[in-house]
Each structure stands twice: as C-alpha cells, then as structure tokens.
Interface confidence: low
C-alpha cells in the first residue's frame, strides 16, 4: 500500500495473506468459513510451491493469539482467467478446514448487486504489499482510503486506454494506491466487499494509471457455484 498507514490491529478480520512456501505473496479476503477470494494471477509459477493462507494476522512475523496458517485443499481460478490479461482475475481458495471464527477472523459480506459503485465513494483497501517504490515490504497490515474513479476516465487513452471492462472498477492512484503484494486483497466500500485488487504489473502511485479492481458482483454466479 503506497501512501497509507498501519491498519488498526485485527480491525479487518476478513483479511488474509496468501503465502507460498511460507512467504506472503498476495492478499485475500475470507468470504466464507472455508473459502478465501484472491486474484488468479497470484499463483504464477507456484505449481511446485506450498500454498497456504494466513488468517487472523496483523503482523506477518510476530506471534499473535488469533493467527493461524491454513493449508489449501483446492485452488479454483476463474475458468476464463488468462496469463496475458487481467480479465476475470479471481481465484477461490478452499481451506483444508473451516476457519476458526472469532473477533479477528470473520468473513466479509460481498456485493451481489451488479451495479457500479458511485464515483467518488471512498473505499478501503488493505494489504501487506510494498509501501515504497524501493520495494520495502511492511510487516504489519497497511490500509488506505481511495476514491472510486469513473470508468470513462479510467479508460482514457492517457490512462488505461479502454482496457477496463464492465467487470472491473478503478480507484484513484495519486500517490495513494495499492501495489505489488496487495493483489488479491479487498476493496471495501461501506463495509461490503466490492472489488479485488488485480495482479497486473501496473505502475503504482501514478495518478494516470489508476488502480484496477475486479468487481465481485459481476462474478456472483461463479462464486456461488464454487462455494456451493
């Protein structure tokens, strides 16, 4: 997270760290007792790695009573996700067992009504992604509030030049932005999950390259079918 601040510890009990071989790779969001939603591209080249999900964490390194690392039973990328585009960039991870719920571990309601969030709405994005252009990684969860940007502006030739589909949304990126390592994490508007940070190699913190988020409401049928 660029231009953000440390989050209040355990105030986002839905927040997950998707890890490969014990290292944080991407964010994720607990959407059901046994399911974490993340971004499909996150597991690039992880076929030989051990994928796990950390729940109940604020610090990645320090012991915390609520922290628990879960093995992954199944990884389900959206069937139309592709290596060379950010379209359909969603991944569902089935935990090896139901998460032990409590004040620091709780699923987040996700948006099912397929309607765009009003431009200008302030939404919260959190993650353990880099906090500087030099690539410094935080140990403790960071967050930032970002205004939603209208799709027409986001699709300007000077911005993302038509790449933003109806199934994506944008947020402003003027020095405050999600960045590498935040992919798969939640964009929360009014206490509801609206978007998932896409995992393209976009430049961060540049106002002409707004943050791109996959709209979960657009994938309600797929999410329901996998969770069923």
């Amino acid at each position: 997270i660029l231009g953000g601040r440390e989050a209040e510890a355990h105030a986002r009990p839905y927040m997950a760290s998707v890890q490969v071989n014990g290292e944080h790779l991407c964010g994720g969001v607990l959407v059901a007792e046994q399911w974490v939603l993340s971004a499909a591209h996150c597991l690039e080249d992880a076929a030989d790695g051990k994928v796990q999900v950390l729940l109940g964490a604020h610090s990645l390194s320090q012991p915390e009573p609520s922290k628990r690392l879960y093995d992954v039973l199944r990884a389900v990328p959206h069937p139309d996700s592709r290596p060379d585009t950010i379209d359909h960039d969603l991944l569902l991870l089935q935990l090896s067992e139901k998460a032990t719920l409590g004040p620091a571990v709780r699923p987040l309601p996700w948006q099912r009504v397929d309607r765009d969030v009003e431009p200008g709405t302030l939404c919260d994005v959190a993650g353990w992604g880099i906090v500087s252009h030099a690539g410094r990684r935080p140990d403790r969860l960071q967050h930032v509030l970002l205004p939603v940007l209208d799709r027409a502006t986001c699709n300007r030739r000077t911005h993302h030049d038509g790449a933003i589909t109806q199934r994506m949304m944008c947020a402003e990126s003027n020095r405050r932005d999600s960045c590498k390592g935040d992919s798969g994490g939640p964009l929360v508007c009014g206490g509801v999950l609206e978007g998932v940070v896409t995992s393209g190699s976009r430049v961060c913190g540049n106002r002409k390259k707004p943050g791109i988020y996959t709209r979960v409401a657009s994938y309600a049928a797929w999410i329901d079918s996998v969770l069923a």
């Epitope: 080249d45 076929a47 030989d48 990884a75 996700s81 290596p83 060379d84």
Partner: antibody, heavy 120, light 112 residues
C-alpha cells in the same frame, strides 16, 4: 503475438549429441516455467524436461528416460530455451516441442516442433 | 511413475453425438499444494496439441462449452456433448502433479 519457434533438429548418429533451441517472443519469458515435450513418429506425447523461472532458482526436472543424458537450460536475456541432448539413442527419434507452462495448467503455448532423427 | 490409462484407444462417433473419454491414474494425482493437475489436450492431424481442460474441470480460454471435464482422485472423464467436425483428432490426458509428468496413450476421435 505469443510465439515459440524451435530449431536445431536434424539427423544424428547413435551416441551423438544435438542442441535444440527455442526462441520465445510476445510474452515475459523470464517469468514462465518452460518445458520440452516430444512425440515419436506415430506415437503419443511424452514430457521430457521442465525448467522453472529465476525466482524458483531455475529448478529442473526430467523424465527418467532422458535423465543424465539431456540438460534443459535457458537464457532469459535472449528469451531462449535450450535442450542439450547427449548420448542419443534411436528411441530419442521424435518431434520435439518447446512448450510454455502457464499458471494453473502446464502447456498453454506450443511451438510447431523440430524433428530429431537418431539413426546410423 | 504415475501411469495414465486412457479408454478407449479409438472412438468412432457421428457428428452431433456425445463422446466420452476415460482416464485413470495409477495413484492419486492431488498435488501437495491441493491442486489436481489433470489436463486434457487435443492434437489435430498435423498440428501441435492444444489445451482444452485444466485442473480436472476448468475449460481453457476459447474452448467451447460442449467440452467438460470431471472426476477426482484417480478417475477422470472428458465429455464432448455434441461432436463437431473440428473436434476430430487425438485426445490426451496428462498429470502434472508428480514428477515425472505423464500423458495418457491417447484416444483417437474419428467419424463413424
């Protein structure tokens, strides 16, 4: 356009050596694991070797039939994949395909292949 | 090594028919990371193979929805709901969960 183009095939005598090359273009070669897959004339597909990306220490894996004879390696700066084949046997005669390893699947982009014939 | 056994070796069908191809692995092909790397490829005459299905049941981009994959553990099936002329060729199952990775022997789908 994502493309893989193999070269280096030909006729070689048993116990001889050959180096196959694969030129990749249209994608970030250095972030992908890569494979060689072969197909003997009129036969099925056989996986030969795999090499992972730099972030995975260029780890390599081989089929038992080629272990200790074949070496897979890559040059990320040139977007090239190679297969050094030594001590060739007649049963190595096949079409050799260079194949990209995608995210959740193994072989998402295939080259057109290069033919290796091992015969005296 | 994991042996992948495909049945039948040859499958004569009429256009518009349903086709079903079976693939059985000699041991479980669930990877240690939880994924089941079971895939289906189609090789049309004179061409390189193409990926159809990955992770048992996920259709690859651009693959028509008449193709579907199913199964778990050691038994897997590829179904084509209505065979079209462009579907003819040799179908291979493949496991990428355990080194050495292995293909099935292939099933030739041909017109009756």
């Amino acid at each position: 356009e994502v493309q893989l183009v193999e070269s280096g095939g030909g006729l070689v005598q048993p116990k001889g050596s050959l180096k196959l090359s694969c030129a990749a273009s249209g994608f970030s070669f250095n972030t992908y694991a890569m494979n060689w897959v072969r197909q003997a004339p009129g036969k099925g597909l056989e996986w030969v070797a795999r090499i992972r990306s730099k972030s995975n220490n260029y780890a390599t894996y081989y089929a038992d039939s080629v272990k200790d004879r074949f070496t897979i390696f890559r040059d990320d700066s040139e977007s090239m994949l190679y297969l050094q084949m030594n001590n060739l046997k007649t049963e190595d005669t096949a079409m050799y395909y260079c194949v990209r390893h995608g995210y959740y699947w193994y072989f998402d982009v295939w080259g057109t292949g290069t033919t290796v014939t091992v015969s005296s | 090594d994991v042996l992948m056994t495909q049945n039948p070796l040859s499958l004569p069908v009429s256009l518009g028919d349903q086709a079903s191809i079976s693939c059985r692995s000699s041991q479980s092909i669930v990877h240690s990371n939880g994924n089941t790397y079971l895939e289906w490829y189609l090789q049309k005459p004179g061409q390189s193979p193409n990926l159809l299905i990955y992770n048992v049941f996920n259709r690859f981009s651009g693959v028509p929805d008449r193709f579907s994959g199913s199964g778990s553990g050691t038994d897997f099936t590829l179904k084509i709901s209505r065979v079209e002329a462009e579907d003819l060729g040799v179908y291979y199952c493949f496991q990428g969960s355990h080194v050495p990775y292995t293909f099935g022997s292939g099933t030739k789908l041909e017109i009756k």
